[in-house]
Interface confidence: low
């Protein structure tokens, strides 16, 4: 079997809402990427797994089952939304996200995903990891691949 | 639609305690706050407290503090308020009203009417 | 605690015309988030309080849009174009910045 290569585009977008009474941010992270079939025949995306880690502290996961099939030496692009909270001993966090001083409140994150694709029965995983910047303060759509060349303020570690 | 269901009217005595209810219904219950708030005869309203039904958490005004205790049973959609030690300073009009993040106090129950006589 | 301060308690006006009802903060509502935590509450006579205005400016669902709300972060008015019957009642502005939350209390609106 040829390969099937997994790649992760970036963040497509971020909606941002705020808990005032409990200093908290949701953020709804919509992630793309591209699956490509290099085979002669056709392969299940069986499921993508997705986490997103802020300050080494994972804020979100999500879970999508029997996505798509992609056929011979085609490419899907797959979008998937991972929702995260920024709270508890994150929530000095909550202050920089409002602060309407501040233009752009990007703040860094790891996007970890995993796809896992059967043909045949025989299962196959590929993972990929990512740092990417995005913005707390507002709802933001990004152009693909945008997000990875942002100007952050570092959160505290 | 969005429904807050409270009992009419509480009679009770002096020194005793009432539980007033307020049945949410036509929303997820766990996703809104719950307020309380009070209304004395030809009086204006005062915020009691709040509850958050997904987790417990409360914040209480000072005032409120020895006298309300605010609860939530999941099970039934219901949100509670215990008074304590009545007197005849806390015959009012007791409402609930829900509120999310952002928009506070769109639904209100219809009150509840609670006495304190002897 | 913030005080809410609605300094007249009634306001007459003639049916057809506009009136302003006025409230004012202890300390400023706007939050660093640009949002300004005032919210207006109509409570026409045996009912309950209904909420008119959120966030100092934003038209709550179902209202008509003869209500508006505007202010600085401290000083907010609630204006009624072409006024109703239906609109008496007592206006409560309140603030939710910070706990506990506290409403002024109260402007009658009467009709002439």
């Known amino acids: 079997p040829r390969s099937i290569d997994v790649k992760y585009i970036g963040v497509k977008s971020a909606y941002v809402s705020y808990d005032v009474q409990k200093r908290t941010i949701y953020l709804n992270i919509t992630n793309t990427l591209n699956i490509t079939n290099n085979n002669y025949y056709s392969v299940e995306v069986e499921n993508i797994t997705a986490q997103v880690q802020f300050a080494k502290t994972v804020i979100g996961k999500a879970r999508l089952n029997n996505i798509t099939h992609i056929g011979p030496l085609d490419m899907k692009q797959i979008d998937y939304t991972v929702p995260t909270v920024i709270a508890e001993e994150m929530s000095y966090m909550y202050d920089f996200c409002t602060l309407i001083s501040i233009k752009v409140h990007n703040i860094v994150l790891m996007m970890q995903v995993t796809v896992t694709t059967t043909y045949f029965g025989h299962s196959e995983q590929i993972s990929q990891e990512r740092y990417q910047y995005v913005d707390c303060g507002r709802n933001t759509t990004y152009q693909l691949g945008q997000s990875e060349y942002l100007n952050v303020l570092q959160p505290q570690q | 639609q969005v429904q807050l269901q409270q009992p009419g009217a509480e009679l009770v005595k002096p020194g005793a305690s009432v539980k007033l209810s307020c049945k949410a219904s036509?929303?997820?219950?766990?996703?809104?706050?719950m307020h309380w708030v009070k209304q004395r005869p030809g009086q204006g309203l005062e915020w009691i407290g709040n509850?958050?039904?997904?987790?417990?958490?409360?914040h209480y005004n000072q005032e409120f503090k020895d006298k309300a205790t605010l609860t939530v049973d999941r099970s039934s959609n219901t949100a509670y308020m215990q008074l304590s030690s009545l007197t005849s300073e806390d015959s009012a009009v007791y409402y609930c009203?829900?509120?999310?993040?952002?928009?506070?106090?769109?639904?209100w129950g219809q009150g509840t009417a609670v006495t304190v006589s002897s | 605690d913030i005080v809410m301060t609605q300094a007249a308690p009634s306001v007459p006006v003639t049916p057809g015309e506009s009136v302003s009802i006025s409230c004012r903060s202890s300390q400023s509502l706007l939050h660093v988030n640009g949002h300004t935590y005032l919210y207006w509450f109509l409570q026409r006579p045996g009912q309950s309080p209904q909420l008119l205005i959120y966030?100092?400016?934003n038209l709550a669902s179902g209202v008509p849009d003869r209500f508006s709300g505007s202010g600085s972060g401290t000083v907010f008015t609630l204006r009624i174009s072409r006024v109703e019957t239906e609109d008496v009642g007592i206006y409560y502005c309140m603030q939710h910045l910070q706990y506990p939350f506290t409403f002024g209390s109260g402007t009658k609106l009467e009709i002439k």
């Open positions: 966030r100092m400016s």
């Open positions: 036509g929303y997820t219950f766990t996703t809104f706050w």
């Open positions: 009203a829900r509120s999310s993040n952002w928009d506070n106090f769109d639904y």
């Open positions: 509850i958050d039904p997904s987790d417990s958490e409360t």
